[in-house]
Interface confidence: low
């Protein structure tokens, strides 16, 4: 098993039934406030629109959003913290017809309604303060 480079950027084609699976571990303890960020971009560029933005402030909160025409939309926040300090996690994002279903370590975590068509997602970027051991897209 080898580590993937972070930021990890991958070209994708998503549709209903697709699952994005991310396995990793926070680089530092939660006291040092590590973050995880996953962005579903509509182009192979970091400044493109984001259909789904998922950001973990480890030990604190999770924020979800979308970005259109360089403008962030209404932020959704969850204080539920399913990630464990120092522990490996498996984050799965299932593409359903009307929403993304986020799973953490096999447990349903949050449903985020589609704001931008899934068919427009061209790239997924995983980054910030994690080591990344797995990135997989299954259709």
């Amino acid at each position: 098993m080898s580590l993937l480079s972070v930021p990890h950027t991958e070209s994708v084609s998503l549709s209903t039934g697709s699952t994005v699976t991310i396995k990793g571990r926070p680089l530092v303890c939660f006291l040092n406030e590590p973050h995880l960020q996953v962005d579903f971009h509509t182009e192979m560029k970091e400044d493109s629109d984001i259909a789904f933005h998922f950001q973990v402030y480890f030990g604190n909160r999770v924020v979800m959003n979308s970005r259109e025409f360089k403008i962030w939309k209404e932020e959704v926040e969850s204080k539920n913290m399913p990630f464990q300090d120092g522990q490996e996690f498996e984050l799965s994002i299932l593409v359903l017809e009307d929403k993304y279903q986020v799973m953490v370590n096999g447990q349903a975590y949050y449903n985020f309604n589609h704001r931008i068509p899934v068919s427009s997602v061209k790239m997924v970027q995983v980054w910030r303060d994690i080591s990344l051991t797995k990135f997989n897209v299954s259709n």
Epitope: S2, L3, L4, S5, V6, P7, R25, P26, L27, V28, C29, N32, S131
Partner: nanobody, 122 residues
Framework: QVQLVESGGGLAQAGGSLRLSCVAS????????MAWFRQAPGKEREFVAA????????YGADSEKGRFTISRDNAKNTVYLQMNSLKPEDTAVYSC???????????????WGQGTQVTVSS
């Protein structure tokens, strides 16, 4: 620009130990992830271990688990590789590398030392 200089290599007996050091100098040298790689004659470069800039997380090649330990002292801008229970197959040139990414992929590291030879005799 970051300069990396390794030391601590040499001849060791099988079952013995060596501690390699890598001193980093240059602007913001302490903010880079650091890694050790090795290359034996006629073989591909091989990942050994990596450590984050804060030293908060380390990662080692599965084959070396329990024998090799990477650590760092940012006050001295030095990264160490403690190698125990050495085997003849550990014979190689060991190089340290620095970069912004924390990974086992050698292509992600921008800065490299010249390397230090480790020879393990049976």
């Amino acid at each position: 620009q970051v300069q990396l200089v390794e030391s601590g290599g040499g001849l060791a007996q099988a079952g013995g130990s060596l501690r390699l050091s890598c001193v980093a100098s240059g602007r913001a040298a302490g903010t880079y992830s650091m890694a050790w790689f090795r290359q034996a004659p006629g073989k591909e470069r091989e990942f050994v271990a990596a450590i984050t800039w804060a030293g908060g997380y380390t990662y080692g090649a599965d084959s070396e688990k329990g024998r090799f330990t990477i650590s760092r002292d940012n006050a001295k801008n030095t990264v160490y590789l403690q190698m125990n229970s050495l085997k003849p197959e550990d014979t190689a040139v060991y190089s340290c590398a620095g970069g912004r990414l924390f990974t086992s992929q050698s292509s992600a590291y921008q800065y490299w030392g010249q390397g230090t030879q480790v020879t393990v005799s049976s």
